[in-house]
Interface confidence: low
């Protein structure tokens, strides 16, 4: 019997070989029941990919973003 469309997170897997220099822009998705989803638009091929939140430069980016938010 057909079921209603099931819940799926936007990121199927996370890519850990994404250079900061190849990122056009980032978006952080706050999707319920999902791990932190960070999506990058790449400069070289315009595709959107999910970035591993454990990447060093991502951690630095998030830290800066949070500091900015709390300073305001």
């Amino acid at each position: 019997k057909p079921v209603s469309l099931s819940y799926r997170c936007p990121c199927r897997f996370f890519e850990s070989h994404v250079a900061r220099a190849n990122v056009k822009h980032l978006k952080i998705l706050n999707t319920p029941n999902c791990a932190l989803q960070i999506v990058a638009r790449l400069k070289n091929n315009n595709r959107q990919v999910c970035i591993d939140p454990k990447l060093k430069w991502i951690q630095e980016y998030l830290e800066k973003a949070l500091n900015k938010r709390f300073k305001m």
Partner: antibody, heavy 123, light 107 residues
């Protein structure tokens, strides 16, 4: 490779419902973001709805809200689109289409389409 | 809803001609525009996504450009197999609207 195979043509009376199926091969249905698009004879393409991973739910075009239901059977990797209260203006070819994805599911475009199912509404 | 206005609605051209199809969005949509080619009795076929990126296998004579509200699909040298209808589509936000189509016919 991914293939979407749709059910055959249907002829329906006004007021009836139609259920079109779309069988996925080459991938499992839960790995896809499936959408439905229709095209009236000689007209353009009209997006009806589909699964939006960012919201975690199926979203429908307002025009079809309350009249369309999109479901799936994960055991057979088949997606369904049911449209009720049919009128002559619903005569169209109905397509299922997969949204492009890599690591990120809703990656912009519809890259793979079913062959289309012609639904004719006539008394 | 975001409206996609495509022009021209039809055009006649000869093999070897340069053809340009334009699409205007009713609001700024960055580069979230895709282009499809459709032949009679067939499903649409993705040519271009993210405004300017070719889908794999698409001939290099097809190029896309634009950002914000104005987008262009160009066929640098029209080939016999290019006579078809072309649609733009926005994937910026649902509902994912299409342009009304441009039919490219043989002159």
């Amino acid at each position: 490779q991914v293939q979407l195979v749709q059910s055959g043509a249907e002829v329906k009376k006004p007021g009836a419902s139609v259920k079109v199926s779309c069988k996925v091969s080459g991938y499992t249905l839960t790995e896809l973001s499936m959408h439905w698009v229709r095209q009236a004879p000689g007209k353009g393409l009209e997006w009806m709805g589909g699964f939006d991973p960012e919201d975690g739910e199926t979203i429908y075009a307002q025009k079809f809200q309350g009249r369309v239901t999109m479901t799936e059977d994960t055991s057979t990797d088949t997606a369904y689109m049911e449209l009720s209260s049919l009128g002559s203006e619903d005569t169209a070819v109905y397509y299922c289409a997969r949204r492009v994805w890599g690591s990120y599911r809703p990656n912009d475009a519809f890259d793979i389409w079913g062959q289309g199912t012609l639904v004719t509404v006539s008394s | 809803d975001i409206q996609m206005t495509q022009s021209p609605s039809s055009l006649s051209a000869s093999v070897g001609d340069r053809v340009t199809i334009t699409c205007r969005a009713s609001q700024s949509i960055s580069d979230y525009v895709n282009w499809y080619q459709q032949k009679p009795g067939k499903a649409p076929n993705l040519l271009m996504f993210a405004a300017s990126t070719s889908q794999s296998g698409v001939p290099s004579r097809f190029t896309g450009s634009g950002s914000g509200t104005d987008f262009t699909l160009t066929i640098s040298s029209l080939q016999p197999e290019d006579f078809a209808t072309y649609f733009c589509q926005q994937s910026y936000s649902p509902p994912y609207t299409f342009g009304q189509g441009t039919k490219v016919e043989i002159k």
